[in-house]
Structure formats: structure tokens, C-alpha cells
Interface confidence: low
Amino acid sequence: DAHKSEVAHRFKDLGEENFKALVLIAFAQYLQQCPFEDHVKLVNEVTEFAKTCVADESAENCDKSLHTLFGDKLCTVATLRETYGEMADCCAKQEPERNECFLQHKDDNPNLPRLVRPEVDVMCTAFHDNEETFLKKYLYEIARRHPYFYAPELLFFAKRYKAAFTECCQAADKAACLLPKLDELRDEGKASSAKQRLKCASLQKFGERAFKAWAVARLSQRFPKAEFAEVSKLVTDLTKVHTECCHGDLLECADDRADLAKYICENQDSISSKLKECCEKPLLEKSHCIAEVENDEMPADLPSLAADFVESKDVCKNYAEAKDVFLGMFLYEYARRHPDYSVVLLLRLAKTYETTLEKCCAAADPHECYAKVFDEFKPLVEEPQNLIKQNCELFEQLGEYKFQNALLVRYTKKVPQVSTPTLVEVSRNLGKVGSKCCKHPEAKRMPCAEDYLSVVLNQLCVLHEKTPVSDRVTKCCTESLVNRRPCFSALEVDETYVPKEFNAETFTFHADICTLSEKERQIKKQTALVELVKHKPKATKEQLKAVMDDFAAFVEKCCKADDKETCFAEEGKKLVAASQAALGL
């Protein structure tokens, strides 16, 4: 339904608080380098304008689209060219090209300082002094570092952030109360950002059809009792929500997400028996809860799939009449029977089924041709099963840190051209699959592991896209969304790589390493490991292990020394010489 004033419509639907928060997120995700104060000023101006439109929808400019209003406002930033360079050229364009231009300039790895957590008392004082500014600053700092963060979900994180400070700043032991909560929010936030980044990449790089296929599979696993028509409706609505958020239309996205949550709760009897608790919660918690809800139980006595999709004489007729609907039904039926499969595996099976029908429905005897299609699924199912089994065994044997190191070596040998920080970040995240998924029983391992790996490999893809250095990465990232993981798994050592020149500076360490947290120290050691492999790609596991063990002993020894800096200088030279000898550098 058309509204005279889109901005008034959204302001009334969302309320002032959410409206302001979402506009701040939108602006910070577009202009990631702008100071906080500048964004607050722009948001206040937009809010005041929105209020005039609520009072009189016919007032001047109130009929303009949100893209026009927001784009005009962003283009008033005085330092646009000097801060953002060619992004300033976007302002010379008309809508919708201007918004597309802003979207293309979103930076997944902005050059921003690491967020350092102040002392608890300092944070509590800031929270009590000006709660509103404190929470706005949280939204701003997260949004500018994660330009694709799912905006309505960020409102939920901000609500939990506020609750943590409200509770803990009056606790007897503020730090013991607050720090675990902040750690949890940080880790969940990073995971949420990465999951949303994959949804946006899916929509932007592979199109709506790819996203809808993913959604059919996932929602069918989650709501196996729901009818196909119901799942299709949810998929259509969910696709709209994510298309809007990924496109920077955050007000529409949040509004439509609220409508979808309302619909799901009003129709939960025909969707899932697991939604009752979620639907009793307030809006932000409700939407989050629905998104994370456990799979409902599968209906009893589901008939064999073969009857409708292999044995029926109408397979080719049904396929020809409505290809995507028929394939959607296949995916729905297969997914609701297989909560034990990853979504990407289900999509590979659907793709194999589609390819077979394309070929066989044009053959002389179609049925004879596709009769054995389900046999083609067996190797596709076994490949991730075997891979997960092997890697979980390795994880159980090594523990998380050493498992990450094994992956660091494996991936550096596959794609040594990729920057060291990216290899460290991605391999550390790949390694977390062990603690995240290997604890699960067999039936939950594959959906946990392979769908998580899809999220992590997408991080590699988006970071690599910014500065492409490896044809192999480009190939695995762009050829097929669902085959990214098998593509990377299949890569062997890159024999074309010319080893990096040895640089002693890379392996020079100082006493500051002693004061780092365990995590930061691990990253330092893992950075050195990647550099070692880049210098000596043919080094054996044993050689690398020996050098890393020596390195760990060296750090431990010097951190216990009275004169730490001298120890690092003198023992460091010896370590470099010994490592060069051990690796034949």
C-alpha cells in the first residue's frame, strides 16, 4: 500500500527510538570513517524532518523516497572527497544509481583502530553520565566496522548491551558481572555479522534464486510440519527482509521483519510447535528467538521421496510446467526429512537432481535415464561426512590451538598469495569449527560444521575480493556458492608459488609479547607460522612443529627473564639462525 510520505510511514511504524537507531546504523555503514558527532548531527536532522512529515505528510520533500532523503543528507558531508576519495563521485549520480554506488563502496575491512575495552569503572561512569550517547556509540562503532550487520538484530544486541551495564554497574563485583557478558556479546556479534555477510553475498553475487533456495532448505529443516505453501510464503517474506537490509533499506527491513515475526506467531499452529516461548517475548527478542529456534520434530511416516520424484511417470511433465516450483518441492521434501544434512549439501543434491532432469527429460526414455538419480547422491553425502569425521578426530587429538595451526599450514600452502592477517583470521575461525561442532552427536555435526564453514569461507571471499591476489581463491569463491567448501578442500599445494624472501624482521620479537593476552600471543605465533610456510612451502609438519616448539620455549624463557628485552634480542637471533638451519632457509 502506497503512503504519501515513506519517511512518515516508517517513523510511525518503528517509533522514534528505533527510527533514530536505524538511521544511525545506516549512515555509519555507508560512511564508515565519519566521526560519531557528525553522524549524530545528521541523524538528528533527519529525525526532525521526519517529525514534520508525521505532522503533515504533504509538507515539502516529504514525498521523496528514503534513498533520496538519506543520500542527499550523506552528500552534505563536507569532507566527503578528502575522506572517501572516489566515493564522493556517487553524489553526482541520481537515484537509484547513487545508492548502488554507496553500496559498492562499503568496506568489509575498514582501516579503523581496534576497539579497546576501557576499565569497567570508566565504562560504568560513561554509561551513567549519558546512557543515550553511550548506547548510540555502541551502535556506531559496531555498524561502521560491520557494514552488513543485520540492523534489526543490532538493535537486539544494543538492548542486551544496555541490560548488561544496567545490571552490572550496580553489582558488588562489576567486572566479574560485566566482562563475561561483554565477551559473550562480542563473540555472538562477530558470528552474527559473518552469518549476515553470507546472506548478503548470496543475494548480491548469486541472485535472489540462490538465496531463496537456501531459505527453502533451511526453513524446511526447521519447520518440517509446515506445508510447502507455508514454507514458500515464509521464504518470499524472508527474502524481502534480507534484500532490504543488504541493500541499505534498514527502516523497511526492520519494519518487514517485525511483520514477519507477527505473522509467524499468529500462524504458529501451522508452522512449528517450537515457537510458543519465542512468541511470548517482546519484539526484538521474539525475532531473534524465531531466527534461532530449534528444528521441530519431523512428521511421522513421511512417504518415500522416490515415489514423486523418480518413480512417477509425471516427473518430466511436472518439471516442465513449473521448473522452480517443482525443484522447490523437491528441496522442501528432502530437507524436511534430513535435519542431519547441511543446507549446502541439500542444495548440491537439488542441483544434481536439476541437472539430471535437464538432461533426461530431453532423452528418448526419460524414466530410464533418471531412474538411478538418487544413487548419484551417495558420494555427495559421504564426502562431507568423511571430511568432518577426519577433522573432528584431528581436533580431538590436537585441541583448538594446534588444530588451528594445522589449518593455517594447510591453507597457507593452498593459497600462499593471500595476506598473512587474512590467513590467520580465516584459519583461526575455520579451526573454531572443532569446539563448535565436534561435541555434537553425528546427526547434528554436518549441519553445524559445513554451514559454519560456508560462513567462514565467505569471509575469505569478501576480504579477497577487495584486493584479489589469487586466481584459485577467485575461482572457488565465484564459480558456485554451494561448492565453495569442496572447492577449497580440493586445492592442493600451489606449486606455482615462488617462496617469499626471508626477512629476519618478520621473526623479531620484543618484550611486549609478554603482556599480551593468551589470544593475542597465539595470534603472534600463528602469524609467524604463516610467514614460515610462505618462506618454506615445502617444509614438513615435523620441521614446522620443531620450529614452533622452539619459538614457544623462547617466548616463555624470555618472558621469565629479568632483562626481557635483552633476552629477546640475543635469544631471538639464535632462534632465527636455528630455524633457518632447521628449514634449510
Partner: nanobody, 115 residues
Framework: EVQLVESGGGLVQPGGSLRLSCAAS????????MSWVRQAPGKGPEWVSA????????RYAESIKGRFTISRDNAKKTLYLQMNSLKPEDTAVYYC????????GSQGTQVTVSS
């Protein structure tokens, strides 16, 4: 399936001691930090103490500092909480949790401090 089973609770006089144990199964115990959480009657869960995966880094709530000691035996897949100088306000159900969560995934063990 992840399982955490606490034991060692009971009735003790003020100033007395107890040692709680938490036997873990179904996950790689040695790869996870662990915590103790308690819930007094009519109150929300309260974080008590945490220990990292290797057992070297420990943290305590202010209310129990100097009286309670957290430890672990990765070979036995067991987490411990040694509680000395117990006070009536330590009365609660004690749970062990993975990480530093205050969400309870187990039955807990009742500790009652009363004369």
C-alpha cells in the same frame, strides 16, 4: 550429547568446607573454559568463578574471593570448586557451565550453610 553432572553438595555449618565436582562428557573438555554459577532461592543465577581450558587462568566473584578455589583435571574431565569458610549467604544450588555463561544446562548440587 553434552552432559555436566555436579556432586559434592550438602549441609554444612558456617565456617565449614565442601568440595564440589563436575563430571563432563560429550565434548572436548580440555578445549573449553569452564565456570561455576550458583542460584540462591528466589534469586537469579550468579556467576561464581571461571577457569581457562589449560587451568592456568582463574577468576572469582568478589563475594567469594580468598575462600573458594576453582581447579580442573582435564585427564579426568572434571571441574572442581573447593569451598572454605562457608557462610549462610553461600547457600544455593551450584551449577557448572561451559565457558562463562550463566545459563544452566544441568541439575546442579545443593549447598546449604546453616547452624
Amino acid at each position: 550429547e553434552v552432559q555436566l553432572v555436579e556432586s559434592g553438595g550438602g549441609l554444612v555449618q558456617p565456617g565449614g568446607s565442601l568440595r564440589l565436582s563436575c563430571a563432563a562428557s560429550g565434548f572436548t573438555f580440555g578445549s573449553f573454559g569452564m565456570s561455576w554459577v550458583r542460584q540462591a532461592p528466589g534469586k537469579g543465577p550468579e556467576w561464581v568463578s571461571a577457569i581457562d581450558s589449560g587451568g592456568t587462568d582463574t577468576r572469582y566473584a568478589e563475594s567469594i574471593k580468598g575462600r573458594f578455589t576453582i581447579s580442573r583435571d582435564n585427564a579426568k574431565k572434571t571441574l572442581y570448586l573447593q569451598m572454605n569458610s562457608l557462610k549462610p549467604e553461600d547457600t544455593a544450588v551450584y551449577y557448572c557451565t561451559i565457558g562463562q555463561s550463566t545459563s544452566r544446562g544441568s541439575q546442579g548440587t545443593q549447598v546449604t550453610v546453616s547452624s
